[in-house]
């Protein structure tokens, strides 16, 4: 039932550019005044383990332009693509490059999208048609989730509740790394 | 699809506090940008504050600063906005809205059903 | 805080053209501001209408267009029906503070 990522048949991949477009400079923005003192969403602590970093999961980043009917983005903008499956982190940065992944002999976990993100984006439009602007919702966080034996998207399962989210300061929208992500990786996306 | 079912009417006294619950079903909450937007009888709409998912924080509306908490609890998916300090003009059906979790944020696209809060002594 | 104005009621007949206006106090009202508009009516919550300026739902009429006109969002409805007769609120997205306008109530003279 949740938004699944690259519901957008029309995106250009290219992985050479890096990072994130700057916003255009928002207008009498007084939003600092209007912050919550303790505003935010904290990070999403999925594993209550003893040792938080025990799964890991991982995170690609890819450049597109993002297109709403005939009308494409002025600039391309930075995804975040939560991939694979889940593991020991420590088997992780490895994983993939040699072409072995861990899975667990029990249920299956997936690296899915957490958190989302918002990114202010200006559409030109064909035909002399007036410019758009949007707000396209990106991943900003990935997280593991177990698959129920049914597989169903809506199936997925927390690895562990999380307790009310107190308002403490959090800003989840990740600065990009600088991403060359490669094909490879893009495939194993999901 | 997204659905908003709110907590039920309340009645407080001047200086107490308040406290709306919203129960998200159809996605999770942290899926979604939550609002509050109150309507005083008779009056227009009125924007309390919300969270931006631009730099994942919660933003109140000046005239709300100081008085007005808005909390999530993920593990139930259930919204809360807190007023404190009532007064008789904060007598009014208090709404949450959302977005529909599209690949555009598009806000304010679902409603819960409003809670009627009234302030008096 | 900037101030957000509507028309505050306006008349059409049935079949008839209408355009609701929403200005800012802050200046030309651009799609940088993102303009809502939502319909409401007594007893109900409201309903969006347009978002973005222009883009309507799946559940808004065909009827109900949304543009910018002389520097202010404007919701025209070509073609009123009864069940039109409700109030209008346009609201303005400031940097992630938002803004509603006072309202339009709309009558539909039949």
């Known amino acids: 039932q949740g938004w699944q990522a690259f519901k957008n048949d029309a995106t250009e991949i290219i992985p050479e550019l890096g990072e994130y477009p700057e916003p255009p400079p928002e207008l009498e923005n007084n939003k600092t005044m209007n912050r919550a003192e303790n505003g935010g969403r904290p990070p999403h602590h999925p594993f209550e383990t003893k040792d938080v970093s025990e799964y890991s999961c991982r995170e690609l980043h890819f450049t597109r332009y993002v297109t709403d009917g005939p009308c494409r983005s002025a600039k391309p903008v930075t995804e975040l693509v939560c991939s694979g499956q889940c593991g020991p982190a420590r088997l992780l940065p490895n994983a993939i490059g040699r072409g072995k992944w861990w899975r667990p002999s029990g249920p299956d976990f997936r690296c899915i999208p957490d958190r989302y993100r918002a990114q202010r984006v200006q559409l030109l439009c064909p035909g002399g048609e007036a410019p758009r602007a949007r707000k396209v919702r990106l991943v900003a966080s990935c997280k593991c989730k177990r698959l129920t034996r049914f597989h169903n998207q809506s199936e997925l399962k927390d690895f562990g509740t999380e307790a009310a989210r107190p308002q403490k300061g959090r800003k989840p929208r990740p600065r990009a790394r600088s991403a060359k992500a490669n094909q490879a990786e893009l495939e194993n996306a999901y | 699809e997204v659905q908003l079912v709110q907590s039920g009417a309340e009645v407080k006294k001047p200086g107490a506090s308040v406290k709306v619950s919203c129960k998200v079903s159809?996605?999770?909450?942290?899926?979604?940008?939550m609002h509050w937007v109150r309507q005083a009888p008779g009056k227009g709409l009125e924007w309390m504050g919300g969270?931006?998912?631009?730099?994942?924080?919660?933003i109140y509306a000046q005239k709300f600063q100081g008085r007005v908490t808005m909390t999530e609890d993920t593990s139930t998916d259930t919204a809360y906005m807190e007023l404190s300090s009532l007064r008789s003009e904060d007598t009014a059906v208090y709404y949450c809205?959302?977005?529909?979790?599209?690949?555009?944020?598009?806000?304010?696209?679902?409603w819960g059903q409003g809670t009627l809060v009234t302030v008096s002594s | 805080q900037a101030v957000v104005t509507q028309e505050p009621s306006l008349t059409v007949s049935p079949g008839g053209t209408v355009t609701l206006t929403c200005g800012s106090s802050t200046g030309a009202v651009t799609i940088d501001h993102y303009p809502y508009w939502f319909q409401q009516k007594p007893g109900q919550a409201p309903r969006t209408l347009i978002s973005?300026?222009?883009d309507k739902h799946s559940w808004t009429p065909a009827r109900f267009s949304g543009s910018l006109l002389g520097g202010k969002a404007a919701l025209t409805l070509s073609g009123a029906q009864p069940e039109d007769e409700a109030e209008y609120y346009c609201l303005l997205d400031y940097g992630g503070t938002f803004v509603f306008g006072g309202g339009t109530k709309l009558t539909v003279l039949g």
């Open positions: 973005d300026t222009d």
């Open positions: 159809g996605y999770t909450l942290t899926e979604l940008s």
């Open positions: 969270f931006d998912p631009e730099d994942g924080e919660t």
């Open positions: 809205a959302t977005d529909s979790a599209g690949y555009w944020y598009k806000f304010f696209q679902h």
